[in-house]
């Protein structure tokens, strides 16, 4: 004969555990039903009555099968520097992530607690490490033979154009200016293109690699906010 299926509540066999979606109630000393996601225990089980579940109220949730007497409160509304990527429902908490151009400076279990704007590299400095959802941009001074004339969280140092005749030599923040003869671009063999950061909408279709001609004297800037003299700006 097949074993009879026990209906909750039931006393478990010594040494055995309760089944999936059940819990052992210490007071009743019975295996009792859990409540489904989106619900909570309104009445705990007794020896003869199973758990009574009720729906979570507005702005509260339970994500798992549970026997909690109260649903969890959804997090507060997303701030102006965030976007709501998951709404508060009876079964899931609200998730706020940083909007494009920002990164998460202080994360929480899901989503972000505090967003900060991505650092912008000032003219003469380019992006050494792009920003991500959880890390800021790292700027570096443009190496000899390269420049950046923008204040940007995405632009890297680009090689100066190579002139047949130079009208104005390039520097770290300005491209070379050629006389009327057409310029050619120096191309560094095997140069690595920097990926675009995930948290920005800026579209740079052809980031140009650094030249390999001059020995690099570039350095990485610290992760914290940089003073203007170090090549980044707060805005």
């Amino acid at each position: 004969l097949p074993a009879q299926v026990a209906f909750t509540p039931y006393a478990p066999e010594p040494g055995s555990t309760c089944r999936l979606r059940e819990y052992y109630d210490q007071t009743a000393q019975m295996c009792c039903s859990k409540c489904s996601p989106g619900q909570h225990a309104k009445v705990f089980c007794t020896k003869t009555s199973d758990t009574v579940c009720d729906s979570c109220e507005d702005s509260t949730y339970t994500q798992l099968w549970n026997w909690v007497p109260e649903c969890l409160s959804c997090g507060s509304r997303c701030s102006s520097d965030q976007v709501e990527t998951q709404a508060c429902t009876r079964e899931q908490n609200r998730i706020c992530t940083c909007r494009p151009g920002w990164y998460c400076a202080l994360s929480k279990q899901e989503g972000c607690r505090l967003c900060a704007p991505l650092r912008k590299c000032r003219p003469g400095f380019g992006v050494a490490r792009p920003g991500t959802e959880t890390s800021d941009v790292v700027c570096k001074p443009c190496a000899p033979g390269t420049f950046s004339n923008t204040t940007s969280s995405t632009d890297i140092c680009r090689p100066h154009q190579i002139c047949n005749v130079v009208a104005i030599p390039g520097n770290a923040s300005m491209d070379a200016v050629c006389t009327s003869t057409s310029p050619t671009r120096s191309m560094a063999p095997g140069a690595v293109h920097l990926p675009q950061p995930v948290s920005t909408r800026s579209q740079h279709t052809q980031p140009t690699p650094e030249p390999s001609t001059a020995p690099s004297t570039s350095f990485l800037l610290p992760m914290g906010p940089s003073p203007p003299a170090e090549g980044s700006t707060g805005d």
């Epitope: 007071t27 009743a28 705990f44 009555s49």
Partner: antibody
Framework: QVTLKESGPALVKPTQTLTLTCTFS??????????VGWIRQPPGKALEWLAH???????FYNPSLKSRLTISKDTSKNQVVLTMTNMDPVDTATYYC???????????WGQGTTVTVSS | DVQMTQSPSSLSASVGDRVTITCKAS??????IAWYQQKPGKAPKLLIH???TLQPGIPSRFSGSGSGRDYTFTISSLQPEDIATYYC????????FGGGTKVEIK
């Protein structure tokens, strides 16, 4: 509104049986999740849970006093009765009845009745 | 049986002081703890249940926190009407009260 009131003898002799009645209003013990329990407090001492009974007649007793306690209910009269056998002077206390919620904490209490055990 | 160790057993504080009472359970009680206030000659009054849920009508200066075996009850700014004895109650495994904390004004 929810009210509970304890009644019973003020004086009991040692070895006698104490019978206390809790009469309540504002809720029904036929409603799922409702329970009534008894708690006592000896003079100048802490609270001690004794027993309680649920709407479905499930009963719980303090393990250290279980052999002396019996709890029962009369749903139609809105009453719960606790009996405690073999009373001793150490059982002198204020006895409270209280309502239990479906999630098992006491939310409303009676005013208490003082029971003295003395010969 | 679950034992509840409540401390301190008594304390004296000034009006406006922050008062903290702790209860330690002998085993994990899954946040099933309530806090009661009892004034002399009166029945206990429920202040907080499920660790931190304040009963309706209870002032917000009362709060609770904790998990596992360790729980805390706090009065953020003691008022003269808060003079009473406070009890914790665990209801995660049967029911056990703490020994009480008598709060007095300096």
């Amino acid at each position: 509104q929810v009210t509970l009131k304890e009644s019973g003898p003020a004086l009991v002799k040692p070895t006698q049986t104490l019978t206390l009645t809790c009469t309540f209003s504002g809720f029904s013990l036929s409603t799922s999740g409702m329970g009534v329990g008894w708690i006592r407090q000896p003079p100048g001492k802490a609270l001690e849970w004794l027993a309680h009974i649920w709407w479905d007649d499930d009963k719980f007793y303090n393990p250290s006093l279980k052999s002396r306690l019996t709890i029962s209910k009369d749903t139609s009269k809105n009453q719960v009765v606790l009996t405690m056998t073999n009373m001793d002077p150490v059982d002198t206390a204020t006895y409270y009845c209280a309502r239990l919620t479906g999630t098992r904490y006491f939310d409303y209490w009676g005013q208490g009745t003082t029971v003295t055990v003395s010969s | 049986d679950v034992q509840m160790t409540q401390s301190p057993s008594s304390l004296s504080a000034s009006v406006g002081d922050r008062v903290t009472i702790t209860c330690k359970a002998s085993q994990d009680i899954n946040k099933f703890i309530a806090w009661y206030q009892q004034k002399p000659g009166k029945a206990p009054k429920l202040l907080i249940h499920y660790t931190s849920t304040l009963q309706p009508g209870i002032p917000s200066r009362f709060s609770g926190s904790g998990s596992g075996r360790d729980y805390t009850f706090t009065i953020s700014s003691l008022q003269p009407e808060d003079i009473a004895t406070y009890y914790c109650l665990q209801y995660g495994n049967l029911w056990t009260f703490g020994g009480g904390t008598k709060v007095e004004i300096k």
